[in-house]
Amino acid sequence: NQDLPVIKCVLINHKNNDSSVGKSSSYPMVSESPEDLGCALRPQSSGTVYEAAAVEVDVSASITLQVLVDAPGNISCLWVFKHSSLNCQPHFDLQNRGVVSMVILKMTETQAGEYLLFIQSEATNYTILFTVSIRNTLLYTLRRPYFRKMENQDALVCISESVPEPIVEWVLCDSQGESCKEESPAVVKKEEKVLHELFGTDIRCCARNELGRECTRLFTIDLNQTPQTTLPQLFLKVGEPLWIRCKAVHVNHGFGLTWELENKALEEGNYFEMSTYSTNRTMIRILFAFVSSVARNDTGYYTCSSSKHPSQSALVTIVEKGFINATNSSEDYEIDQYEEFCFSVRFKAYPQIRCTWTFSRKSFPCEQKGLDNGYSISKFCNHKHQPGEYIFHAENDDAQFTKMFTLNIRRKPQVLAEASASQASCFSDGYPLPSWTWKKCSDKSPNCTEEITEGVWNRKANRKVFGQWVSSSTLNMSEAIKGFLVKCCAYNSLGTSCETILLNSPGPFPFIQDNIS
């Protein structure tokens, strides 16, 4: 049909944090590169109907559905979604194409469905259909990568059985220690599944998809390095593959490596050796010990020895189920208002944990760092000196762990007062929890030194939001003090604060704050 316009439908994904429902827009936000949705004419439909390719969107993602119309003259339009019509504001781009956009911010289930765009141009009328659905991430998985030997080749394949299909990369580093951090210039990344260069100092394989990134390090014993001061330990679950690499460098080729489990040599087919000359003409040998699917009896000390190097060993422990070992007893801390302080949890876990820190129903990202002794540590320093309950939660495929912390900030009491017809109450959240005194101000005691002990009731209550303690003191009104000024004072080791209250008939009460350090 000659009269049909040239139409292009695109999807634009946004990195944005606003929240809103679908809205028509002529000028969408800053975006990622547009994705062509095809927009093909739908066959056997009454009228002219174009259909864009189905759009799958993550929950909370922000997108723009956009139509570019190459037709002469003006156009008018209308969006329809779930039988509701939405305003439509076309504009023209630099190539004089009509541009119509629908912005969906923070995608939710209610915003999924069919979006119909009716366009009227001077020449013809037509409809464009977009189907937007929420991506089903419940089926998504991200599994830690594992290694396999490539058939008939001295190479390792990195495999991660994940959905959607992950991007696999090798992360290689040839220097020692700290300089092998992820963003260091010493680190080389190779986005491929097969690795032939297996002589490097540090070899890791990482898999990433929409759920994040998981890495596995090739466990290595280096006979040219002094053994680490704590026993190197490798945990695996029954059925997982075991890979340990032994590496040694010598001035010439006249040396051999062997692997032993406890005191028995590994069977043929459970190891393979590679060697190469380095740039300074020394010989590097590596000997891999591997078991394609471990059983409980593969547990034990694996020792790599050489005819020219001292032996080194690692303990391999095969477990039926994953675990998280840490002390779960709650911990209380008391710090000054400007004191630097971090919560920390030391744990041993396999497989690696996912974790969060929570305070006042708000979750914070959790970082973990491996220690030399096989333990890991997670620290949380971002408490901003807010007192209350902090929760560390960790889990892996097989285990869960929760630990509670209480943070108390040492400070002078601040007093708030309120009164009713029958009583006066004072509140304070200073720490250590304050003690209270009530004093009566009268002609006999203009400095309010006459202490009131009758009818006073003190209590401490947990302010549920933060898990923070608040102390209160209530004075029941008696005839003896009605019409007088009374003073409530809260004091702890850091100071005293007082409030003065006029005990008269009901109504608004004047309070006079009185800070005494």
Epitope: L231, P232, G256, E262, N263, K308, H309, S311, Q312
Partner: nanobody
């Protein structure tokens, strides 16, 4: 459970001798064992070890002066240190199967 129990060590005059011993339990072969040392402010370094063909290895600075030996029946490894020098002053550690002994102080006075 692997345990390494060290004995010997102490204070000795330069030129003198000392003998260190390391008794192992839970270890299957004494040729897995070695001696390392750590001087104040320095990295731990190899002193002497056995290799997988039964021969011995020595750190460059102790060759010809120190001798490593083993008693397979008693699962004991010893280090005989002769012609000691002040620079041999260090804490000496026995190593085997990924585990370390408790460390033995050797002080060589001039």
């Amino acid at each position: 459970q692997v345990q390494l129990q060290q004995s010997g060590g102490g204070l000795v005059q330069a030129g003198g001798s000392l003998r260190l011993s390391c008794a192992a339990s839970g270890i299957f072969k004494t040729n897995y064992m070695a001696w390392y040392r750590q001087a104040p402010g320095k990295q731990r370094e190899l002193v002497a070890a056995f290799t997988n063909d039964g021969s011995t290895l020595y750190g460059d600075s102790v060759k010809g002066r120190f001798t490593i030996s083993r008693d397979d029946a008693k699962y004991t490894v010893s280090l005989q240190m002769n012609s000691l020098k002040p620079e041999d002053t260090a804490v000496y550690y026995c190593y085997g199967l990924g585990h370390w002994g408790q460390g033995t102080q050797v002080i060589v006075s001039s």
